[in-house]
C-alpha cells in the first residue's frame, strides 16, 4: 500500500515532498515565533522588531567604498560570487527521505496561489503548519516562555547608512551606522500596516490550540539576541540547500505555492545572520562590530 512504503526513487511527482516542506517551514516559523512571538501570535511590536532586525524597517543608504590600495582592479565585486555551495549538514538536513520527481510544473496558473504561508504562515497562531496549518498558527516551541519586550529605539525617520569596506583578503565587511535624519521619510510608520494574519489574534481562537512542553528548557532569547555565537549556529543555506531541505528538487522551476514554503526559512536565515561571519575584533584592519558577508547564493 503506497502509504506505508517509500521507494528510493522519487516519491512526489511534482518534485516537492510536501510533508517535508510543511515540517521544515514549521521549524523555521517556530524559530521566528520563539524569538518574536508571544502567545502564539506576532504582535505589531514583535513584527516591527523582526523587520528591524532583518534590516527592512527603514530606508537605508548604502555607500560602497573602493579601496584601491587593496583592490586596484575593482575585483572585489566578484568576491560575492565566490562562496558557492557550502555543504552543510545541520540537524535540519533531511535528505534521506525526500526524493524528488519530475515536476508537473503546475506552474501556478495566473493567480499562482500565493499561499499566505509565508508571512501569513504561522503568524496567526495556531494552525499553521504550513500556512497555518501548515497553516496559519504561530507555533512556538514548547520552551518558549515570556518574551522580553524591547522598546523600539529607532524611529521611522532615521536612516541607516551601510558602508562596505573592502579588506585585503577580498572579504567585504558590512558596517551599519545609525544616522538620525530630520524630516519624514514615510507617509506613515512602516510597521503600522502589517499583514492581516499578523495582527488578527481572533484567528488564534478558531485555530488549533497549542500546549507547551515544559520539559524542554531553553532560555528564550530577547529580540536582540546575540546571533551565531558558538551555541548552535544556524547554517547559511544557499539556494540548493534551501530547496533540498524543504524536499524540493533543484532542477525545476518554483511556482508561487512552492516558494511560499521557503519564506520562513529565508526570513529566519536573514534574521539569524546565518550568512554573516561575526569577525573577531582582533584583526587590526577590521573595525569593531562588523560583519563579514558570506554570500552563499
Amino acid at each position: 500500500f503506497p502509504q506505508t512504503t517509500e521507494k528510493i526513487s522519487p516519491n512526489w511527482e511534482s518534485g516537492i515532498n510536501v510533508d517535508l516542506a510543511i515540517s521544515t517551514r514549521q521549524y523555521h516559523l517556530q524559530q521566528l515565533f520563539y524569538r518574536y512571538g508571544e502567545n502564539n501570535s506576532l504582535s505589531v511590536e514583535g513584527f516591527r522588531k523582526l523587520l528591524q532586525n532583518i534590516g527592512i524597517d527603514k530606508i537605508k543608504r548604502i555607500h560602497i567604498h573602493h579601496d584601491h590600495d587593496h583592490h586596484s582592479d575593482h575585483e572585489h565585486h566578484s568576491d560575492h560570487e565566490r562562496h558557492s555551495d557550502h555543504e552543510h549538514h545541520s540537524e535540519h538536513e533531511h535528505h534521506s527521505d525526500h526524493d524528488h520527481h519530475s515536476h508537473h510544473n503546475h506552474a501556478a496558473s495566473g493567480k499562482n496561489k500565493r499561499k499566505a504561508l509565508c508571512p501569513d504562515h504561522d503568524s496567526d497562531s495556531s494552525g499553521k503548519d504550513p500556512r497555518n496549518s501548515q497553516g496559519k498558527g504561530a507555533h512556538r516551541p514548547e520552551h518558549a516562555s515570556g518574551r522580553r519586550n524591547v522598546k523600539d529605539s529607532v524611529s521611522a525617520s532615521e536612516v541607516t547608512s551601510t558602508v562596505y569596506n573592502t579588506v585585503s583578503e577580498g572579504t567585504h565587511f558590512l558596517e551599519t551606522i545609525e544616522t538620525p535624519r530630520p524630516g519624514k521619510l514615510f507617509p506613515k510608520d512602516v510597521s503600522s500596516s502589517t499583514p492581516p494574519s499578523v495582527t488578527s489574534k481572533s484567528r488564534v481562537s478558531r485555530l488549533a490550540g497549542r500546549k507547551t512542553n515544559e520539559s524542554v528548557s531553553e532560555p528564550r532569547k530577547g529580540f536582540m539576541y546575540s546571533r551565531n555565537t558558538n551555541e548552535n549556529p544556524q547554517e547559511c543555506f544557499n539556494a540548493s540547500k534551501l530547496l533540498t531541505s524543504h524536499g524540493m528538487g533543484i532542477q525545476v522551476p518554483l511556482n508561487a505555492t512552492e516558494f511560499n514554503y521557503l519564506c520562513p526559512a529565508i526570513i529566519n536565515q536573514i534574521d539569524a545572520r546565518s550568512c554573516l561571519i561575526h569577525t573577531s575584533e582582533k584583526k587590526a584592519e577590521i573595525p569593531p562590530k562588523t560583519y563579514s558577508l558570506q554570500i552563499a547564493w
Epitope: 510536501v18 510543511i22 535540519h92 496549518s133 497553516g135
Partner: antibody, heavy 113, light 107 residues
Framework: QVQLVESGGGVVQPGRSLRLSCTVS????????IHWVRQSPGKGLEWLGV???????DYNAAFISRLTISKDNSKSTLYFQMNSLRAEDTAVYYC???????WGQGTLVTVSS | EIVMTQSPATLSVSPGERATLSCKAS??????VVWYQQKPGQSPRALIY???YRYSGVPARFSGSGSGTEFTLTISSLQSEDFAVYFC?????????FGQGTKVEIK
C-alpha cells in the same frame, strides 16, 4: 521504507484515559511532523493534532483540554494520550506523516462500559 | 474551523465513464487541499496534494483542480479498482479538516 505502526487500541471504559503509540521507521522524527487523525462512522475523519520536529504541538481546539501528544525521538515513537473518554470517541485512530500517503494502518478504540 | 463540503454524497458511475467529485471550503484555503481514496478496511491513500499535484504511483486518470474555495477531483475513465470513498482535506488552517466523503459506486 517508510512505515508508521499504531498500537494500544482496544476497549476503554468511559471516563478513563487512552494511550496510543505510533512507531515510525524509514525516516526521522526530527525531520517530519506527525499528525493524529481519527475516523468514526458518525463524524468521519477528524484531525486531532500534530507534534512537530522540535517537539511543539498543535491541537484541534475541540480536544485541547484532554489531549497530549509527545514523542521520543531516540525510539522513533510518538505517544497519544486522550483523557475522559466518552462513547463518541470510539473510532479508528491513525498517525500520519502530514498530508501525504504515509499513514499507519490505524488502531481501533472502542469506548464502552 | 473551515468546513469542507463534498458533493455528491454518492456517485453511481459505470466503468470507463468519467467521474467528477466536488469539494467546497467554507473559506479560502488557497491550494492547500489533498484528495484521498479509501477502500474498506484500509487507511486513506493520498492521490492529489496542493489541489492539483499527483503523488507518484497514482494513475494519470486522476487529476485535481481548483483553488480558493472550490476543488474538483476528476477520474477520467473509471476502473474497477477506483470504486471507493474519496475525501478532500484542507491543510491551510488549523484544525485541518476533511470533507464527509463521496462514495463512488458501480452503476
Amino acid at each position: 521504507q517508510v512505515q508508521l505502526v499504531e498500537s494500544g487500541g482496544g476497549v476503554v471504559q468511559p471516563g478513563r484515559s487512552l494511550r496510543l503509540s505510533c512507531t515510525v521507521s524509514g525516516f526521522s522524527l526530527t525531520t517530519y511532523g506527525i499528525h493524529w487523525v481519527r475516523q468514526s462512522p458518525g463524524k468521519g475523519l477528524e484531525w486531532l493534532g500534530v507534534i512537530w520536529t522540535g517537539g511543539t504541538t498543535d491541537y484541534n481546539a475541540a480536544f485541547i483540554s484532554r489531549l497530549t501528544i509527545s514523542k521520543d525521538n531516540s525510539k522513533s515513537t510518538l505517544y497519544f494520550q486522550m483523557n475522559s473518554l466518552r462513547a463518541e470517541d470510539t473510532a479508528v485512530y491513525y498517525c500520519a506523516r502530514g498530508p501525504s500517503s504515509y499513514w499507519g494502518q490505524g488502531t481501533l478504540v472502542t469506548v464502552s462500559s | 474551523e473551515i468546513v469542507m463540503t463534498q458533493s455528491p454524497a454518492t456517485l453511481s458511475v459505470s466503468p470507463g465513464e468519467r467521474a467528477t467529485l466536488s469539494c467546497k471550503a467554507s473559506q479560502n484555503v488557497d491550494t492547500n487541499v489533498v484528495w484521498y481514496q479509501q477502500k474498506p478496511g484500509q487507511s486513506p491513500r493520498a492521490l492529489i496534494y496542493s489541489a492539483s499535484y499527483r503523488y507518484s504511483g497514482v494513475p494519470a486518470r486522476f487529476s485535481g483542480s481548483g483553488s480558493g474555495t472550490e476543488f474538483t477531483l476528476t477520474i477520467s475513465s473509471l476502473q474497477s479498482e477506483d470504486f471507493a470513498v474519496y475525501f478532500c482535506q484542507q491543510y491551510n488552517n488549523y484544525p485541518w479538516t476533511f470533507g464527509q466523503g463521496t462514495k463512488v459506486e458501480i452503476k
